[in-house]
């Protein structure tokens, strides 16, 4: 037991799962039910987080670590430590103050969360649109229009196949 250090600051010896109890001459007391301390030297134990309503428990509280929450199906976490749950939308939609709304033409969202984003502008990279965009998917850019002009192809056509076993005439 580190008695020399405890003479200087008795609280520094209190391990995680306990607190330094001023009501008991600063002895280390285990955290009361439904509270925790995740580090040593604490003067109080923190009340365990309760995952209620739209939150559900991902990890139970213990005397040394807080509960962790996530969101019930149909919702997703926002903020540090899942401090909020936000409603999911379908792909091709975004959440507005009035609920889930389809992405406007020229925008897409391939997730159940987040906002609709503009389709990629292929021409900015000197390319052409290979596959058109939808509410759920971005456009797919292909080669530049110049690469597709007649005579510009660098691909040589394959030689005609010969039937096996026949010698040329």
């Amino acid at each position: 037991f580190e008695r020399t250090r405890s003479l200087q600051d008795p609280c520094s010896n209190c391990p995680a799962g306990t607190f330094c109890d001023n009501n008991r001459n600063q002895i280390c007391s285990p955290c009361p039910p439904n509270s925790f301390s995740s580090a040593g030297g604490q003067r109080t134990c923190d009340i365990c987080r309760q995952c209620k309503g739209v939150f559900r428990t991902r990890k139970e509280c213990s005397s040394t670590s807080n509960a962790e929450c996530d969101c019930t199906p149909g919702f997703h976490c926002l903020g540090a430590g899942c401090s909020m749950c936000e409603q999911d939308c379908k792909q091709g939609q975004e959440l507005t103050k009035k609920g889930c709304k389809d992405c406007c033409f020229g925008t897409f969202n391939d997730q159940k969360r987040g906002i609709c984003r503009p389709w990629t502008n292929c021409s900015l990279d000197g390319k052409s649109v290979l596959v058109n965009g939808t509410k759920e998917r971005d456009v797919v850019c292909g080669p530049s229009p110049a690469d597709l002009s007649p005579g510009a192809s660098s691909v040589t056509p394959p030689a005609p196949a010969r039937e096996p076993g026949h010698s040329p005439q």
Partner: nanobody, 111 residues
Amino acid sequence: AVQLVESGGGLVQPGGSLRLSCAAPGNISSLRVIAWYRQGPGKQRELVAWIAWDDIAHYVDSAKGRFAIWRDNTKKTTYLQMNSLKLEDTDVYYCNSGDSWGQGTQVTVSS
């Protein structure tokens, strides 16, 4: 506050073992948090081991690997098994739950 009753202390040689018991009176239900402390003459009470409210056993560094705490809820008794005892383990040992304390049991390690 209810009175807890410790027993099992005594004189033991270095390297020996003791098992301390802490019994709660029959009129209370199981104790959710229970701890063992030690106290030497003129010293502060120091935590040794405890069973937390989540039923997990915890130990201070000097007790890890040598001491074991567990409880038998049917007997309303908590035990502290002390192995590989050292001279410096000599102290009065108390059990505690909330505001309830035992009278203490003396553990003396001497050759």
